[in-house]
């Protein structure tokens, strides 16, 4: 059967800081999260079956003034979807997206979402992971911050 | 045959107000809009065949100063793609996206688009609908504001 | 076999100016770029096989103050994915997205990404192309600026 995964953010373990970090805590079996013929391990989505896959990610950032004061109004809110090959230890960014934002204290609430998607050849054993900037601003809802993949066709 | 739908906004019947509303008027059979083995009824896209589907939405907001004066520069421009189960009357958000925006009167034109997409298990009889904030700012073009789904695989 | 393409920007030949232009230089056979049972010619992705396709594009814009001074802080950063039919010489926009942005000189770096995607009926011989505003601001990375398509199903 065709492999797929839809992984939603596990907000109980989101890193802090403003620099780029890899997000390692995702749900794979609750709510909208699900996985079949792929493996989720150590924060990475592992390919078990060669093929061409459509990969996607939706990342939401938000801040309410009651959460505290931002260190800077000028933010880089970014996502990077990366592929790591174990055989040849290397990591490459498949897709990136995001925006620089000016989140002023004049507004009590700020929100921003990024969506990226693309069609990629993946080999068994390769691993997909998601990196973001400003992880402490992530929206923890399952409808907000997630990534996934589904196999579309075999490699000829 | 594999079900699909691509529904484009019917701008002759867009609600007003700034709060979140469900968009019920969509085209399903003109221009780029089309549907097969799914049903469009009462503003909702109804699933006729169990399966895993890729769902997507593209929502564009725009304002020209000639359209009138905005009540606030601080806008929440959001989309929510929701699933309703008739058997168990409940509605859940599958995907959300958007941004807070500062649309100043100092600029004559403003534009912003949101895209969301994800892979979900849908059962026959379940309904997909789209909610947005600030519907009166929607771009009425068929290339701008649309949502859709296509079945990728059966449920094992 | 099911057709697909994932084309990444060829930054050696990006047009200048701020007006809408068609992007004609894309890679189809290096890095993440690939194509099968479709043709890339004269800056357009040509359909060789009738079917329903999922089309997508990810477009990143960026500016660093070291690159020079912008002519205006008020930018329209847009993408248009268009279909051209040779038999009936006409071009139609399938998908559009983007945002107006205020890129002030107070910040040394600016970034913004657009993602669009949708499901369309394509006939053999039809051509897909991508137009953007402000092409000189495009991010030239293969993970940043790309578009693609994959066939999902036949036309009944």
């Amino acid at each position: 059967a065709q492999p797929f995964a839809h992984l939603t953010i596990n907000a109980t373990n989101i890193p802090t800081g403003s620099h780029k970090v890899s997000l390692s805590s995702w749900y794979h079996d609750r709510g909208w999260a699900k996985i079949s013929n792929m493996t989720f391990s150590n924060g990475k989505l592992i390919v078990n079956q060669d093929g061409f896959y459509y990969l996607y990610a939706n990342i939401c950032f938000r801040h309410h003034e009651t959460s505290g004061d931002l260190a800077t109004e000028y933010l880089q809110l970014m996502v990077y979807v990366t592929k790591t090959s174990i055989k040849i230890p290397s990591s490459h960014t498949l897709m990136k997206g995001g925006s620089t934002k000016y989140w002023s204290g004049n507004s009590e609430f700020h929100f921003y979402s990024i969506n990226v998607g693309g069609f990629f050849k993946l080999r068994s054993g390769e691993e997909i992971s998601v990196e973001v900037s400003n992880p402490s601003l992530l929206d923890p809802d399952q409808d907000a911050t997630y990534f996934g993949a589904f196999k579309v066709r075999d490699i000829d | 045959a594999q079900p699909f739908a691509h529904l484009t906004i019917n701008a002759t019947n867009i609600p007003t107000g700034s709060h979140k509303v469900s968009l019920s008027s969509w085209y399903h059979d003109r221009g780029w809009a089309k549907i097969s083995n799914m049903t469009f009824s009462n503003g909702k896209l109804i699933v006729n065949q169990d399966g895993f589907y890729y769902l997507y939405a593209n929502i564009c907001f725009r304002h020209h100063e000639t359209s009138g004066d905005l009540a606030t520069e601080y806008l929440q421009l959001m989309v929510y793609v929701t699933k309703t189960s008739i058997k168990i009357p409940s509605s859940h958000t599958l995907m959300k996206g958007g941004s807070t925006k500062y649309w100043s009167g100092n600029s004559e034109f403003h534009f912003y688009s949101i895209n969301v997409g994800g892979f979900f298990k849908l059962r026959s009889g379940e309904e997909i609908s789209v909610e947005v904030s600030n519907p009166s700012l929607l771009d009425p073009d068929q290339d701008a504001t649309y949502f859709g789904a296509f079945k990728v695989r059966d449920i094992d | 076999a099911q057709p697909f393409a994932h084309l990444t920007i060829n930054a050696t030949n990006i047009p200048t100016g701020s007006h809408k232009v068609s992007l004609s230089s894309w890679y189809h056979d290096r890095g993440w770029a690939k194509i099968s049972n479709m043709t890339f010619s004269n800056g357009k992705l040509i359909v060789n096989q009738d079917g329903f396709y999922y089309l997508y594009a990810n477009i990143c814009f960026r500016h660093h103050e070291t690159s020079g001074d912008l002519a205006t802080e008020y930018l329209q950063l847009m993408v248009y994915v268009t279909k051209t039919s040779i038999k009936i010489p006409s071009s139609h926009t399938l998908m559009k997205g983007g945002s107006t942005k205020y890129w002030s000189g107070n910040s040394e770096f600016h970034f913004y990404s657009i993602n669009v995607g949708g499901f369309f009926k394509l006939r053999s011989g039809e051509e897909i192309s991508v137009e953007v505003s402000n092409p000189s601001l495009l991010d030239p990375d293969q993970d940043a600026t790309y578009f693609g398509a994959f066939k999902v199903r036949d036309i009944d």
Epitope: N106, E108 | S18, A71, T72, E73, Y74, S136 | -
Partner: nanobody, 126 residues
Framework: EVQLVESGGGLVQAGGSLRLSCAAA????????MGWFRQAPGKEREFVTA????????GYVDSVKDRFTISRDNTKNTVYLQMASLKPEDTAVYYC???????????????????WGQGTQVTVSS
């Protein structure tokens, strides 16, 4: 709960100017759309002008365009109405009004405003 107090009204000759002020207390002023309405003797209260929460969007009734200017100072919780080239038909009680933005565009009807001041009299003599 927002309390609104108008000031600056009075008697002025035709062609003259006046500046009305409306001070707000309670609530977060920057979150409110502010408007001015007026009621002439024996007539219904009518919309004059409104200003967006941040002050960059303004709307006016046609009869006062290019003569009246609405502005606001969110640091002082105050909205102003500068009135120039006054005419006898501008004679009315002027009311300040406030509402949170429930509509995308500036509200122009009385029922869309939640809070009202007591009014200040403007009389333009010929």
């Amino acid at each position: 709960e927002v309390q609104l107090v108008e000031s600056g009204g009075g008697l002025v000759q035709a062609g003259g100017s006046l500046r009305l002020s409306c001070a707000a207390a309670g609530g977060t002023f920057r979150n409110y759309v502010m408007g001015w309405f007026r009621q002439a003797p024996g007539k219904e209260r009518e919309f004059v002008t409104a200003i967006s929460t941040g002050g960059s969007w303004t709307g006016y009734v046609d009869s006062v365009k290019d003569r009246f200017t609405i502005s606001r100072d969110n640091t002082k919780n105050t909205v102003y109405l500068q009135m120039a080239s006054l005419k006898p038909e501008d004679t009315a009680v002027y009311y300040c009004a406030a509402t949170t933005p429930a509509t995308t565009y500036l509200p122009r009807s009385e029922r869309q405003y939640d809070y009202w001041g007591q009014g200040t009299q403007v009389t333009v003599s010929s």
